[in-house]
Interface confidence: medium
C-alpha cells in the first residue's frame, strides 16, 4: 500500500522536511503533489511525468520544493504555514489513480528565555514572589528548576499560567536559591540564566557567647552577639536597661561585683525593620558560690539516653570535682568528663545509675559541695513474671495469677487469654475453673513513659488427670567429685505430691542427696560414678498418679590410675612384648606410650616383636580424658635377658 513518511515529523522553522514515499507502484505514468488532504488543482504543488522526466510547478508551488524520481518531495527553508497535510497523486500506466497522504508539523526555534520577578527583595514569612518565564510562546512547555533540581513538592510552591509563572508563597530563607526556567517544544529546548532569590529575614533571636554567666571578680568580661539576618544585623548593647554601645562585641576589663546584672543584646535589620533581643544575667562573685547540678535530661530512658550533668556556675580557672554514691567517680567507659571536668556525661544510662551525684568547686581553702541529685531513670518493663508457677490445676479451684515486671514508672498490666484481652489489672482471678479455662494466658506489661511493652505467655491446663511428668536437669554430663546435679520434676502442679525412684527403688538415705522445692527437685552433690543410674519422678494427687520416663545420669569420671598387663617385668631375648594398658574412664580415655621417655604410638596395646636386651627400660602408659580434663599414667620397668642366662624368666607372649 502506498504510504508517505515525513522525515522529520516535527520540523523547525527554516529547516527542511522530506516527504518520503513507500511502496510506489511500478509502471507509472506520473505523479503529482498537493497541499492538503485531497487532490485539488488549485492546491497542486508540482507534477512529474516519468516518460519526459519533466516537473511542472502548480499554483501552490513556492520555489522551495524539489521532487525526486522516486516521487519523494523535499521542502526547504520551512515556514510556519507549511504545517499540515500533503497528498501524493500517482497515475499508473493503465491510468488507474492511487493516492496517499502524509503530514508534518512546523514549530519555531525557541529563543533563550529569561525570568522576570515581581519582588526582588521579599521578606521572610510575609511576602510572596512570582517568577514569570519570558517570552510567552505558543505551543511551548514551561519547566522550572531550583538549584538545578526539578521543583520540590511543597504547598508553598504554585505553578500557574500554563506553568509559565512560579509563585512562592510566604517565602523563607531556605528559598534563597538559584531559579531557572526552561521552554520546550518538539524541536527545541532552551534554559534561562539563573536568578538568585534574595530573601530578607531576621534578625533571629540573638545568641550571646560565651554561655557562662558566672565570673570571678578581676576577670575580663568579653561578650559577643550574633543573630542570623539578611542583610546582616546592626547590634546594640544595654546593661541593666541602659544603652552602652553599638557594636557586636562588648568588652569590660577587670570586672567587679558591681558589674553583675542583666546584659541585653539588640539586633536590628534595617530592611525588614525588625528588632530582636536576648538577655543574659551575669553574676560576678567575690568568692566561689555554692555549686549546683543541672541535667540535660531529667527522665532518661535506660539503654537509650545519655545524661549530661553540669556543675554550675561556670567559673574560669576553677577545679571541679564529682562524687557518685558518696564515692569518687569509678572508672567506667560509660562515664565521661569534659576537658574542664565541669560536665559529667553518663552514656547509655542504666537503672543502676540513679546516684546520688554531687559536684564540688575547689578553692584555696576548701571544697564547696553541691546538694545531691538523684536521676529518675526510666526503665523496663523487663519480661514479666507470672506467679504462681503452676501450669496444671484441678477443676473447681480458683485460678489467681499475678504478674510483675520491673519498670519505672511502674508498669501497667493487661491479661489476655488465647489472644483475647480480658482485663487491665496486675492480678487475674477466675473462680471455680473448668477444663474450658485451659489456654494461653498472656501478661502484657507496658511502660507509658518509655512506650515499651513486654509479654510473657503461660500455658494453663485444667484437668483432673495429671500429665505424664518429665525430668529436666541442670547438668547433662557432670564430672565426678566436682559437679552437683539438680533434677526437677516437670510440670509444677498445685496440690501435688512429688516422688523419686533410683533404679526402681525409693531414694536411699545419703548426705549427698537432697530434696527441695516441695520434693520437686532432687539434688545430687559431688556426683560419683555410682550415681550413673536411672532416675524416675512421679506425681500424684487424690485422683491420679503418673511416672516419668527414666533419665540415666551420665557421670564423667577418670581416668583412674592405669593397669599394664601382663604383670611380668622380665623377658627372654627373642620373645614378643605385648603390653596392654587399661584405665577406668567415662568417656573412654586416649592412650599413649613412652619408652625411656621417648613418645611411641597412641594405642591401648604396645607390641614389639623379638625383643633383645636393647629393649630394656621404663615403659610408661599415659591416659587422658578430654571431657574431665584429667590425666594419669603408670610406669613399668622391663628387663630383657639373653636366652638361658637366668632361670624363672618369662618366655614372652
Amino acid at each position: 500500500k502506498l504510504t508517505i513518511e515525513s522525515t522529520p515529523f516535527n520540523v523547525a522553522e527554516g529547516k527542511e522536511v522530506l516527504l518520503l514515499v513507500h511502496n510506489l507502484p511500478q509502471h507509472l505514468f506520473g505523479y503529482s503533489w498537493y497541499k492538503g488532504e485531497r487532490v485539488d488543482g488549485n492546491r497542486q504543488i508540482i507534477g512529474y511525468v516519468i516518460g519526459t522526466q519533466q516537473a511542472t510547478p502548480g499554483p501552490a508551488y513556492s520555489g522551495r520544493e524539489i521532487i525526486y524520481p522516486n516521487a519523494s518531495l523535499l521542502i526547504q527553508n520551512i515556514i510556519q504555514n507549511d504545517t499540515g497535510f500533503y497528498t501524493l497523486h500517482v497515475i499508473k500506466s493503465d491510468l488507474v489513480n492511487e493516492e496517499a497522504t502524509g503530514q508534518f508539523r512546523v514549530y519555531p526555534e525557541l529563543p533563550k528565555p529569561s525570568i522576570s520577578s515581581n519582588n526582588s527583595k521579599p521578606v521572610e514569612d510575609k511576602d510572596a514572589v512570582a517568577f514569570t518565564c519570558e517570552p510567552e510562546t505558543q505551543d511551548a512547555t514551561y519547566l522550572w528548576w531550583v538549584n538545578n533540581q526539578s521543583l520540590p513538592v511543597s504547598p508553598r510552591l504554585q505553578l500557574s499560567n500554563g506553568n509559565r509563572t512560579l509563585t512562592l508563597f510566604n517565602v523563607t530563607r531556605n528559598d534563597t536559591a538559584s531559579y531557572k526556567c526552561e521552554t520546550q517544544n518538539p524541536v527545541s529546548a532552551r534554559r534561562s540564566d539563573s536568578v538568585i532569590l534574595n530573601v530578607l529575614y531576621g534578625p533571629d533571636a540573638p545568641t550571646i557567647s560565651p554561655l557562662n554567666t558566672s565570673y570571678r571578680s578581676g576577670e575580663n568580661l568579653n561578650l559577643s552577639c550574633h543573630a542570623a539576618s539578611n542583610p546582616p544585623a546592626q547590634y546594640s548593647w544595654f546593661v541593666n536597661g541602659t544603652f552602652q554601645q553599638s557594636t557586636q562585641e562588648l568588652f569590660i576589663p577587670n570586672i567587679t561585683v558591681n558589674n553583675s546584672g542583666s546584659y541585653t543584646c539588640q539586633a536590628h535589620n534595617s530592611d525588614t525593620g525588625l528588632n530582636r533581643t536576648t538577655v543574659t544575667t551575669i553574676t560576678v562573685y567575690a568568692e566561689p558560690p555554692k555549686p549546683f547540678i543541672t541535667s540535660n535530661n531529667s527522665n532518661p530512658v535506660e539503654d537509650e539516653d545519655a545524661v549530661a550533668l553540669t556543675c554550675e556556675p561556670e567559673i574560669q580557672n576553677t577545679t571541679y570535682l564529682w562524687w557518685v554514691n558518696n564515692q569518687s567517680l569509678p572508672v567506667s567507659p560509660r562515664l565521661q568528663l569534659s576537658n574542664d571536668n565541669r560536665t559529667l556525661t553518663l552514656l547509655s544510662v542504666t537503672r543502676n545509675d540513679v546516684g546520688p551525684y554531687e559536684c564540688g568547686i575547689q578553692n584555696e581553702l576548701s571544697v564547696d559541695h553541691s546538694d545531691p541529685v538523684i536521676l529518675n531513670v526510666l526503665y523496663g518493663p523487663d519480661d514479666p513474671t507470672i506467679s504462681p508457677s503452676y501450669t496444671y490445676y484441678r477443676p473447681g479451684v480458683n485460678l489467681s495469677l499475678s504478674c510483675h515486671a520491673a519498670s519505672n514508672p511502674p508498669a501497667q498490666y493487661s491479661w489476655l487469654i488465647d489472644g483475647n484481652i480480658q482485663q487491665h489489672t496486675q492480678e487475674l482471678f477466675i473462680s471455680n475453673i473448668t477444663e474450658k479455662n485451659s489456654g494461653l494466658y498472656t501478661c502484657q506489661a507496658n511502660n507509658s513513659a518509655s512506650g515499651h511493652s513486654r509479654t510473657t505467655v503461660k500455658t494453663i491446663t485444667v484437668s483432673a488427670e495429671l500429665p505424664k511428668p518429665s525430668i529436666s536437669s541442670n547438668n547433662s554430663k557432670p564430672v565426678e567429685d566436682k559437679d552437683a546435679v539438680a533434677f526437677t520434676c516437670e510440670p509444677e502442679a498445685q496440690n501435688t505430691t512429688y516422688l523419686w525412684w533410683v533404679n526402681g527403688q525409693s531414694l536411699p538415705v545419703s548426705p549427698r542427696l537432697q530434696l527441695s522445692n516441695g520434693n520437686r527437685t532432687l539434688t545430687l552433690f559431688n556426683v560419683t560414678r555410682n550415681d550413673a543410674r536411672a532416675y524416675v519422678c512421679g506425681i500424684q494427687n487424690s485422683v491420679s498418679a503418673n511416672r516419668s520416663d527414666p533419665v540415666t545420669l551420665d557421670v564423667l569420671y577418670g581416668p583412674d590410675t592405669p593397669i599394664i598387663s601382663p604383670p611380668d617385668s622380665s623377658y627372654l631375648s627373642g620373645a614378643n612384648l605385648n603390653l596392654s594398658c587399661h584405665s577406668a574412664s567415662n568417656p573412654s580415655p586416649q592412650y599413649s606410650w613412652r619408652i625411656n621417655g621417648i613418645p611411641q604410638q597412641h594405642t591401648q596395646v604396645l607390641f614389639i616383636a623379638k625383643i633383645t636386651p636393647n629393649n630394656n627400660g621404663t615403659y610408661a602408659c599415659f591416659v587422658s580424658n578430654l571431657a574431665t580434663g584429667r590425666n594419669n599414667s603408670i610406669v613399668k620397668s622391663i628387663t630383657v635377658s639373653a636366652s638361658g642366662t637366668s632361670p624363672g624368666l618369662s618366655a614372652g607372649a
Partner: antibody, heavy 124, light 110 residues
C-alpha cells in the same frame, strides 16, 4: 461414645437464610467450646467461630462477622449455626466440632470430635 | 491473622516410602514450651480427622507411621512407610491465636 450429629442437606435460594443444627451425645456441651468450620467444594477449611454454651459467649473470625450467628440450646445439648443473606459463596459443607475428651493437654483450639457436616447449596 | 502456607500443594509417593509435608507460619506459633500446631487428615466425603496435636503428639488411635515435628514457624508432618489408605488431603492448623488452617496438601499413592 462421644458424637456430633448434624442436620441434613439444605437447598436454599439466594438472599435467604438457613439454620443448621449439631446435637452432641456422650458429653455435655456446657463443658466444651463448640466450633464451626466451613469447607467450600474442592477448597480448604475455614474456621467460622466458637460459642461457649454455658454462657452464650461467642467469637467469630472477622470474615464471618455479620454472616454467621451461633447459638446453643443446652437442654437439648444442641448447637446451631445460622447463615444470612446467602450467596453462591456460601455454598459449602459446614462442620461442627469440639475439643473432645481424648487428650488433656491444654488448648481450646484443636478439634478431635467432628460432625459429618451439613451441605448447604445456594441456588439463584 | 497468622497465615499458614503448606507445601507442596500435591504429592505423589510410592507405597512404602516416606511422605513429607511442610507448613510455614507467618509468625511464631510457639509459646510457653508448647508449639500450637496440629495436623488433620481428610478423606473425600468425610470430615477431617485429628492426627497430631501440639506439633508432635500422636492422637490416640492414629498409627505410629504418622509423626510431627517443628517449632516456631516451621513444621513438618511425616508419614513412613506410606500405605494405600493414607491417600487423602492433609491440613495444618494453628491455635496460637484465633485458629486458621493451611491450604491443604493432596497425597496420592502409586
Amino acid at each position: 461414645e462421644v458424637q456430633l450429629q448434624q442436620s441434613g442437606a439444605e437447598l436454599v435460594r439466594s438472599g435467604a437464610s438457613v439454620k443448621m443444627s449439631c446435637t452432641a451425645s456422650g458429653f455435655n456441651i456446657k463443658d466444651y467450646y463448640m466450633h464451626w468450620v466451613k469447607q467450600r467444594p474442592e477448597q480448604g477449611l475455614e474456621w467460622i467461630g466458637w460459642i461457649d454454651p454455658e454462657n452464650g459467649d461467642t467469637e467469630y473470625a472477622p470474615k464471618f462477622q455479620g454472616k454467621a450467628t451461633m447459638t446453643t440450646d443446652t437442654s437439648s445439648n444442641t448447637a446451631y449455626l445460622q447463615l444470612s443473606s446467602l450467596t453462591s459463596e456460601d455454598t459449602a459443607v459446614y462442620y461442627c466440632n469440639t475439643r473432645g475428651l481424648s487428650t488433656m493437654i491444654t488448648t481450646r483450639w484443636f478439634f478431635d470430635v467432628w460432625g459429618a457436616g451439613t451441605t448447604v447449596a445456594v441456588s439463584s | 491473622d497468622i497465615v499458614l502456607t503448606q507445601s507442596p500443594a500435591s504429592l505423589t509417593v510410592s507405597l512404602g516410602l516416606r511422605a513429607t509435608i511442610s507448613c510455614r507460619a507467618s509468625k511464631s506459633v510457639s509459646a510457653s514450651g508448647y508449639s500450637y500446631m496440629h495436623w488433620y487428615q481428610q478423606r473425600p466425603g468425610q470430615p477431617p480427622k485429628l492426627l497430631i496435636y501440639l506439633a508432635s503428639n500422636l492422637q490416640s488411635g492414629v498409627p505410629a507411621r504418622f509423626s510431627g515435628s517443628g517449632s516456631g514457624t516451621d513444621f513438618t508432618l511425616n508419614i513412613h512407610p506410606v500405605e494405600e489408605e493414607d491417600a487423602a488431603t492433609y491440613y495444618c492448623q494453628h491455635s496460637r491465636e484465633l485458629p486458621t488452617f493451611g491450604g491443604g496438601t493432596k497425597l496420592e499413592i502409586k
